[in-house]
């Protein structure tokens, strides 16, 4: 049990284009072919103005036209829903495909892809109807980019609504060292193939992947919980064989000053195959990128029973420290080190006494000030539900 | 382009000090492990060091306290700094950069032209 | 300290010919293993890392093998370009000592 993490499968609220919560001062687009098509009138299920937003420019061959949707905080964002210009059936303009792309700070964008590495999404088939897409995996934004696509020079107009959560863990990145291939009687592929940062020299770092998606990973690594997807998808594993020093070391990057209370990392125990619970952790903290580590590293041995190979949540408890940065380093207990998720128990610190600026995710004004104050899901909202075997699934 | 230029090497006597450079261009040094690997004349590959990205140094057993890696990462270059040169030491020196394979491992995928430095009185 | 030994040191062949190297551990490290050729006057190229998986641009005649501490590169059928000196390494995230090397002449 992930006590604290979140549930991807409850993260799946309207974060408010429909119900008019995101006001309209936060969507905005490339281009309007008038006034009467602004973004404004990009809202699902809305027959203002002419009935959806539609660009100015065509969309083939270029697909540089986009609107976007600014969430003002971090959300993890599980689903999508799009329309055509429906205008009382007099609007015949709708997108058969578009891709997404997304930002947590407004600079960096990352192109949204499904597992398999596909970045277009299937659309919309006539004006009116509204068509739900998973998002698998989801994506951790601020900021949403919807580029609407054709095969052939054509009209296109769009009509959205993001359906998502609150992130609330504030993590905004992490860093390792990129995931390994294990040698089976098949190939275990242990990579974190949803990881939205950079790869470079053997680290993976500014972004977030598979530790962060909310999927926890099954007893046999092998498994996964995912249809079509490779041996190990839901791991991401090291072999101790690669680090002479006895451990793993990873970096964690949040958006505010913040106090920890827990980290927990679901680890796999196959020790038949390899995998075993780490030995022990030791995490340290600073407040900021250029700052010093502080003090020394709170330490936690783990007993991990050998004989239970089931797969298991492990809470590192970090007593409170203070920091925006975190540097763990996961001790082997044997062969390979394999995690599915990791995530934070932590409250926002108000400190007058900051020296450097606050991230800049945040939106303006102050920030709250306890995230357990917070609501993770809008009022008298169900999150809409995942149909087994849909297209949307 | 992507390369490595490294440079400093020359004839110098038995005993004395000499650094070498190693300049990057078309990607930052700090992101990566950085090797050191030299080759005596008509010799195999020796492995020398290596510095991590986070500024941990890694020696041979034989290079440990008379060799010693650094970087500055304003100037995008790796240094060799070699004392108490032997004539031993006389080689080409290659620095090198790790990249991992699509299986998480990792392999020198770039390497300097060498630079050549002959230790003799 | 890992200990990386190869055997042949030099091997006569003729193109065509299948080829076969082999590299020793002097304990296990898994699949923590890359191939490099080398020409004279040449830096090192990467072959392989992570026992099996080719560079990118290396042709598919060459294969590597093996885990633990007995390793294989094989060249299915050598050609003109394949005459050089070929080394292996244990390349972890720390030391990485080479293999001696394996020098591949023109039979």
């Known amino acids: 049990d992930m006590k604290g993490h979140f549930d991807p499968a409850k993260c799946r609220y309207a974060l408010g284009m429909q119900d008019r919560t995101i006001p309209d001062s936060d969507i905005s687009v490339s281009s309007s072919w008038s006034d009467s098509t602004a973004a404004r009138h990009s809202r699902l299920e809305s027959s203002d103005g002419d009935g959806a937003w539609c660009p100015a420019g065509p969309v083939f061959p270029k697909e540089e036209e986009y609107l976007q949707v600014d969430l003002r905080r971090l959300h993890l964002v599980a689903l999508v829903g799009t329309q055509g210009r429906h205008a009382g059936g007099l609007g015949k303009e709708f997108s058969r495909s578009y891709r997404l792309r997304y930002s947590r700070d407004g600079r960096r964008w990352m192109d949204w892809k499904d597992r398999w590495g596909q970045e277009v999404i299937s659309g919309n088939e006539d004006p009116g109807g509204v068509v739900l897409k998973d998002l698998g995996p989801p994506m951790v934004a601020r900021l949403v980019r919807f580029y609407p696509r054709a095969d052939r020079v054509m009209s296109v107009c769009l009509r959205v609504e993001l359906y998502g959560c609150l992130w609330r863990d504030g993590l905004l990145s992490y860093t390792a060292p990129v995931g390994q291939t294990m040698q089976l009687s098949e190939m275990v592929y242990l990579n974190d193939s949803t990881y939205d940062g950079y790869t470079a020299g053997g680290l993976q770092y500014g972004g977030l992947g598979q530790l962060a998606d909310g999927v926890v990973g099954l007893d046999d690594f092998r498994q996964s919980q995912e249809l079509r997807v490779w041996p190990g998808y839901d791991y991401v594993g090291w072999s101790n064989h690669s680090f002479p020093s006895g451990y793993v070391e990873m970096e964690f990057e949040f958006d505010r000053l913040r106090s920890f209370q827990t980290m927990q990392v679901h680890c796999n125990n196959m020790h038949t195959l390899g995998a075993r619970l780490p030995g022990g952790v030791e995490c340290r903290f600073k407040r900021g990128p250029a700052m010093a580590w502080e003090g020394e590293p709170v330490h936690h041995a783990l007993g991990g029973s050998l004989g239970d190979p089931r797969a298991r949540a492990i809470s590192v408890p970090l007593g409170g420290h203070v920091g925006r940065f975190l540097q763990c380093r996961f001790l082997f207990a044997g062969p390979w080190l394999l995690f599915s998720e990791i995530s934070f128990i932590s409250d926002v610190v108000n400190d007058s006494s900051d020296t450097f600026p606050p991230a800049p995710w945040w939106p303006p004004g102050p920030p709250p000030t306890n995230f357990s104050s917070l609501e993770l899901e809008p009022r008298g909202q169900q999150p809409v539900a995942k149909a087994e075997g849909s297209p949307t699934a | 382009q992507v390369q490595l230029v490294e440079s400093g090497g020359r004839v110098v006597q038995p005993g004395r000090s000499l650094r070498l450079s190693c300049t990057a261009s078309?990607?930052?040094?700090?992101?990566?492990?950085m090797l050191w690997v030299r080759q005596a004349p008509g010799k195999g590959l020796e492995w020398i060091g290596t510095?991590?990205?986070?500024?941990?140094?890694y020696y041979a057993s034989w290079a440990k306290g008379r060799f010693t890696i650094s970087r500055d990462n304003s100037k995008n270059t790796l240094y060799l700094q070699m004392n108490s040169l032997r004539a031993e030491d006389t080689a080409v020196y290659y620095c090198?950069?790790?990249?991992?394979?699509?299986?998480?491992?990792?392999?020198?995928?770039?390497w300097g032209q060498g630079t050549l430095v002959t230790v003799s009185s | 300290d890992i200990q990386m030994t190869q055997s042949p040191s030099s091997v006569s062949a003729s193109v065509g010919d299948r080829v076969t190297i082999t590299c020793q551990a002097s304990?296990?490290?898994?699949?923590?293993l890359a191939w490099y050729q080398q020409k004279p006057g040449k830096a090192p190229k990467l072959l392989i890392s992570?026992?099996?998986d080719l560079a990118s641009g290396v042709p598919s005649r060459f294969s590597g093998s093996g885990s633990g501490t007995d390793f294989t590169l094989t060249i299915s059928s050598l050609q003109p370009e394949d005459f050089a000196t070929y080394y292996c390494?244990?390349?972890?995230?720390?030391?990485?000592?080479f293999g001696g090397g394996t020098k591949v002449e023109i039979k």
């Open positions: 090198a950069r790790a990249d991992t394979g699509d299986n998480g491992y990792l392999g020198l995928q770039l």
């Open positions: 078309g990607f930052s040094l700090n992101r990566y492990y």
């Open positions: 510095i991590s990205y986070g500024d941990t140094t």
């Open positions: 304990q296990s490290i898994g699949s923590v």
């Open positions: 992570g026992v099996f």
């Open positions: 390494q244990y390349i972890p995230y720390g030391s990485s000592p």
